[in-house]
């Protein structure tokens, strides 16, 4: 069922079908006998009770006040009253733009990131049973789409998709043809969510070790979901059975990015593990960044400046 009209201030375009639905609808069915009234006041005018006799354009149903169509002089305040329940709306009817297929003041703006999923579906659940056909226009040019009941665009966004998309529903009521237009201003922007991945800590790390012992080299980065973090060492990774890449750990940050950590475990350190580069790389669509570790025998650490020590 169509949800009730909860917004207290509503702007609509002249010449289109429009409805107000009060928000105690389920309650109203329970108390069928209760008197339910709709009122309008505009400017200094007192409340005027609305009924089908007050205008051929107005229809009253259980929970709904319908306009066929709404016109400029329908601007004003509307009230629904039932027992001790009252709901009020302020309705502003604006002029249709005669030179365009849509009215600029009645446009919903959406920002879509390039390559992200982009969807426009032309639906109108309230008038669904009365709609004969629906057309989708881009910048007021009709798009040729297969489904003329609910035209839909579903794709990965491209910059060329930017523009004004208007869903126009054509419907009949009491022998007259009406249309309802819903327009979206779609702006395609670059992927704003991507950060340049950052490897945490110094770019070059000398690690003091003892032969025969084990060491864990921790590489941490702040990165995007798609970014990869990996270790490179030796001629061909995996040639040394004493070197193991541990499973990557990822924690999502409050900003929706990822804090990743990948440990390289070197067991039973031998001479061949000393003074060689163990590189940790983070790669993204923006490029790569690398951090290097060098294992140095504890006795040799005296030759290295203090600020490059890592333990």
């Amino acid at each position: 069922a169509e949800s009730c009209t909860s917004r207290p201030h509503i702007t609509v375009v002249e010449g289109e079908p429009f409805y107000l639905k009060h928000c105690s609808c389920s309650l109203a069915h329970e108390i069928e006998t209760t008197t339910k009234s709709w009122y309008k006041s505009s400017g200094s005018q007192e409340h005027v009770e609305l009924n089908p006799r007050s205008s051929s354009r107005i229809a009253l149903h259980d929970c709904v006040l319908e306009f066929w169509p709404v016109e400029l002089n329908d601007t004003g305040s509307y009230f629904f009253q039932m027992k001790n329940y009252t709901q009020k709306w302020k309705l502003n009817v604006i002029r249709r733009n005669k030179h365009s297929c849509f009215t600029e003041r009645q446009v919903t703006s959406k920002i879509v990131e390039v390559k992200k999923f982009f969807q426009i579906t032309c639906e109108n659940s309230y008038y669904q049973t009365l709609v004969n056909s629906t057309s989708l226009y881009k910048n007021c040019k009709k798009l040729l789409l297969e489904n003329n009941k609910n035209p839909t665009i579903k794709k990965n966004a491209e910059f060329e998709d930017q523009g004004y998309y208007s869903c126009v529903h054509f419907l009949h009521h009491n022998g007259k043809l009406f249309n309802i237009t819903k327009t979206f201003n779609i702006t395609i922007v670059e992927d704003r969510s991507n950060i340049v991945p950052v490897l945490l800590g110094p770019k070059l790390n000398h690690v003091a070790v003892e032969l025969g012992k084990n060491v864990r080299l921790n590489c941490s980065a702040l990165l995007n979901e798609e970014d990869v973090i990996y270790w490179m060492f030796g001629e061909e990774n995996g040639s040394d059975p004493n070197i193991h890449e541990e499973k990557e750990m990822r924690i999502m940050t409050p900003e929706g990015k990822w804090h990743a950590s990948k440990v390289l475990r070197i067991e039973n350190i031998g001479e061949s593990n000393l003074n060689v580069l163990y590189n940790c790389t983070v790669a993204s669509t923006g490029g790569t960044d690398t951090k290097s570790f060098i294992l140095v025998r504890k006795a040799d650490m005296a030759d290295i400046p203090g600020h490059v020590f890592t333990r």
């Epitope: 910059f159 798609e226 990869v228 990557e248 990822r250 669509t285 923006g286 790569t288 960044d289």
Partner: antibody, heavy 115, light 113 residues
């Protein structure tokens, strides 16, 4: 729209150097790396290396290490690829491409190395 | 380096028929941390730069007809053209972007039977 515009064709002598430019427009240059890919006549695609437009970090294919240099000029959103000590087997169309899967390509620059 | 091997080297298919190109990587390009396959497919016509068709192994690039689809995971991948059109005649390449150097397959030449 998003595009990469490359410099024109070149004819070089063996031992010489070449420098191809690739000007980006329609997107934020520093958000994407630029890869260079070459294609010898009638052959497949060979990745030469790439550069991060954000921080200038480079990563080159092993076989070109020492002969190739990739640079960027963020003020003009332009990437450059220089290849030195040219040989006849460097004759190829050189492409610049965006990102790590290459969604935008330049039209290519034909470089002919001949004595 | 990760070696990409395509099969077959060339393929002749009738118009309207299905075309299938395979690509095998020498090591997995599936990243367990995000379950993404770092594999792309390109189409190249004579005298033109390659054109991206598929990335993340199965995501179709915007503007690419839906007769093109990508599948597979780990080391084995497939590009399928469900109903071959005349304009699909080209060389097709797979490429891994999991580890540098980013390597391409040798290419598969697709022709009309």
């Amino acid at each position: 729209q998003v595009q990469l515009v490359q410099s024109g064709a070149e004819v070089k002598k063996p031992g010489a150097s070449m420098k191809v430019s690739c000007k980006a427009s329609g997107y934020t240059f520093t958000n994407f790396g630029i890869s260079w890919v070459r294609q010898a006549p009638g052959q497949g695609l060979e990745w030469m290396g790439w550069i991060s437009a954000y921080n200038g970090n480079t990563n080159y294919a092993q076989k070109l290490q020492g002969r190739v240099t990739m640079t960027t000029d963020t003020s003009t959103s332009t990437a450059y690829m220089e290849l030195r000590s040219l040989r006849s087997d460097d004759t190829a169309v050189y492409y610049c491409a965006r990102g790590w899967f290459f969604d935008i390509w330049g039209r290519g620059t034909l470089v002919t190395v001949s004595s | 380096d990760i070696v990409m091997t395509q099969s077959p080297d060339s393929l002749a298919v009738s118009l309207g028929e299905r075309a299938t190109i395979n690509c095998k990587s020498s090591q997995s390009v599936l990243y367990s941390s995000n379950n993404k396959n770092y594999l792309a497919w390109y189409q190249q016509k004579p005298g033109q730069p390659p054109k991206l068709l598929i990335y993340w192994a199965s995501t179709r690039e915007s503007g690419v007809p839906d007769r093109f689809s990508g599948s597979g995971s780990g080391t084995d991948f497939t590009l399928t053209i469900s109903s071959l059109q005349a304009e699909d005649v080209a060389v097709y390449y797979c490429q891994q972007y999991y580890r540098t150097p980013y390597t391409f397959g040798q290419g598969t030449k697709l022709e009309i039977k």
